[in-house]
Interface confidence: medium
């Protein structure tokens, strides 16, 4: 079972050879698509392999912003031929996430396909880390294999790479150890429950609240930490602000996402942006725990 | 295994002409763009003109640029380039080369043009 | 046109010695630097593109490093066969311009 994502490629090619991306779609080059075309094939160590973030079977829904759906296949090639000149192109790639059925706890083995010189897409940070922890996961780029494997998520504990124990080994090795992997890359990770924004732990709840602007501030403050795995806590809100005015939203409150972005991995600084840039509907994922019985 | 062989070198007389050829053999000619590099006795690298898969684009050094023309014919994996006009600064030993996406990675023998009076 | 230059435009140096050679472009070329090795009477090889990519069938110990304008070439442990001439080549845009060389020599 699969689910699909879009995401934003930029690729940087050359105007003789071009991003190593082949499109198809349609049977005659002139004829109207009536859907998006599909990557075709993939040159080897290309920009578009290199990239680690697009693969054969992917649906190109736009070209540098022009929708491909309603244009032909020649103009999807031009488009392309186009930016080649320039040296870059914007994707707008669909593509399709696998549905995995994983535990919330405990320690499994994942495999991913790894090709010299393409990304895996595993961010990994030492962030605040004691000697003897594990290193954790810190980021899933969008796109990669490892993100599109459906079981990996920012907050698990790396523990092992192709069987090499990551107990005391530095970060910069571990980052080098999954650089130099060929073929087939087995990562063993353990998830925490801790680690789970989903799960509803003994005495908490979260929720979604939608909040429309309609040009006005929000009435939030939110505080937190530069380390990825702090919480993200609402500190203070406007009296009879619109935040506050929902009776939804109260101080000490954690958000989990703003507009379906996780801020699971994030730090202070990326949930203060992605409040900037949320647009006039602002959706809040919010847990909020419960008072205990003393 | 890819190869490259250049052929058609040779001493020509300034104002002349010559056109070299460049056989490729080992790999799908038509889907790598190719150029030309030029190396003066005792000198340095010096890139010549460049052509696409498919022949539709071509680029030029300023120093050949209206004297050289690269061309390719993808039926019988040959590269080109006509050398009109020839002086002196053009004596040189030609490389042919397949450019992919990040370098040139595949070189020819190179042969020589003496271009001299 | 981009100018590519090197330095140093020779060298002297033993078996076993650490060596870097750097290339700065004359405008920013992202990572659209190649390095390739020549021996006389020999055509170029690549050793190096995308400024830090190993070409297949390199020896290990040639790397690369840099982006914008400014690159290095690092050799850790010279091999006698290491001995030639180095050049750095931006594939950023036409003309494809080289750097003046870097002849290595046995010191």
């Known amino acids: 079972i699969v689910h699909t994502e879009t995401t934003e490629v930029v690729l940087c090619g050359d105007p003789l050879s071009g991003f190593g991306l082949q499109l198809q779609g349609g049977i005659f080059a002139t004829e109207t698509l009536s859907s998006p075309p599909l990557v075709c094939f993939i040159e080897p160590d290309s920009p578009a392999e290199r990239c680690g973030l697009l693969q054969v079977g992917d649906r190109v829904l736009s070209i540098n912003g022009i929708a491909t759906e309603d244009g032909t296949m020649e103009e999807a090639n031009q488009l392309l031929r186009d930016a080649a000149l320039a040296h870059k192109v914007v994707l707008e790639v669909e593509f399709d996430v696998a549905e995995s059925v994983i535990p919330s706890s405990g320690t499994f083995h994942v495999k991913l396909p790894k090709k010299r010189s393409v990304e895996l897409g595993i961010t990994i940070s030492s962030a605040s880390r004691k000697r003897g922890e594990p290193l954790i996961i810190s980021d899933i780029k969008k796109g990669s294999v490892a993100h599109r494997t459906g079981t990996l998520e920012p907050g698990d504990k790396l523990l092992a790479i192709d069987n090499i124990r990551l107990d005391n080994c530095p970060m910069e090795d571990a980052v080098q150890i999954l650089r130099q992997c060929e073929d087939l890359v087995k990562l063993k990770i353990r998830k925490d429950e801790d680690n789970s924004d989903e799960l509803e732990t003994t005495g908490a709840v979260s929720y979604t609240v939608e909040l429309k602007r309609y040009g006005g501030p929000l009435g939030i403050t939110i505080s937190g930490t530069e380390e990825p795995f702090d919480p993200i806590v609402i500190s203070g809100l406007t009296k009879r602000g619109l935040a506050e005015r929902t009776g939804a939203i109260h101080v000490g409150d954690r958000i989990l996402a703003i507009n379906n972005v996780s801020l699971k991995g994030r730090p202070l600084s990326e949930a203060i942006h992605l409040l900037q840039v949320a647009g006039e509907t602002v959706t809040l994922k919010i847990k909020k725990q419960l008072d205990r019985p003393l | 295994e890819v190869q490259l062989l250049e052929s058609g070198g040779g001493l020509v007389q300034p104002g002349g002409s010559l056109r070299l050829s460049c056989a490729a053999s080992?790999?799908?000619?038509?889907?790598?763009?190719m150029s030309w590099v030029r190396q003066a006795p005792g000198k340095g690298l010096e890139w010549v003109s460049a052509?696409?898969?498919?022949?539709?684009?071509?680029y030029y050094a300023d120093s050949v640029k209206g004297r050289f023309t690269i061309s390719r014919d993808n039926s019988k994996n040959t590269l080109y380039l006509q050398m009109n006009s020839l002086r002196a600064e053009d004596t040189a030993v030609y490389y042919c080369a397949r450019i992919h996406f990040y370098g040139l990675d595949y070189w020819g023998q190179g042969t020589l043009v003496t271009v001299s009076s | 046109d981009i100018q590519m230059t090197q330095s140093p435009s020779s060298l002297s140096a033993s078996v076993g010695d650490r060596v870097t050679i750097t290339c700065r472009a004359s405008q920013s070329i992202s990572s659209y630097l190649n390095w390739y090795q020549q021996k006389p009477g020999k055509a170029p090889k690549l050793l190096i593109y995308?400024?830090?990519s190993l070409q297949s069938g390199v020896p290990s110990r040639f790397s690369g490093s840099g982006s914008g304008t400014d690159f290095t070439l690092t050799i850790s442990s010279l091999q006698p066969e290491d001995f030639a001439t180095y050049y750095c080549?931006?594939?950023?845009?036409?003309?494809?311009?080289f750097g003046q060389g870097t002849k290595l020599e046995i010191k």
């Open positions: 080549q931006q594939s950023y845009s036409t003309p494809y311009t």
């Open positions: 080992g790999f799908t000619f038509s889907s790598y763009a």
């Open positions: 995308a400024a830090s």
């Open positions: 052509i696409s898969g498919s022949g539709g684009s071509t």
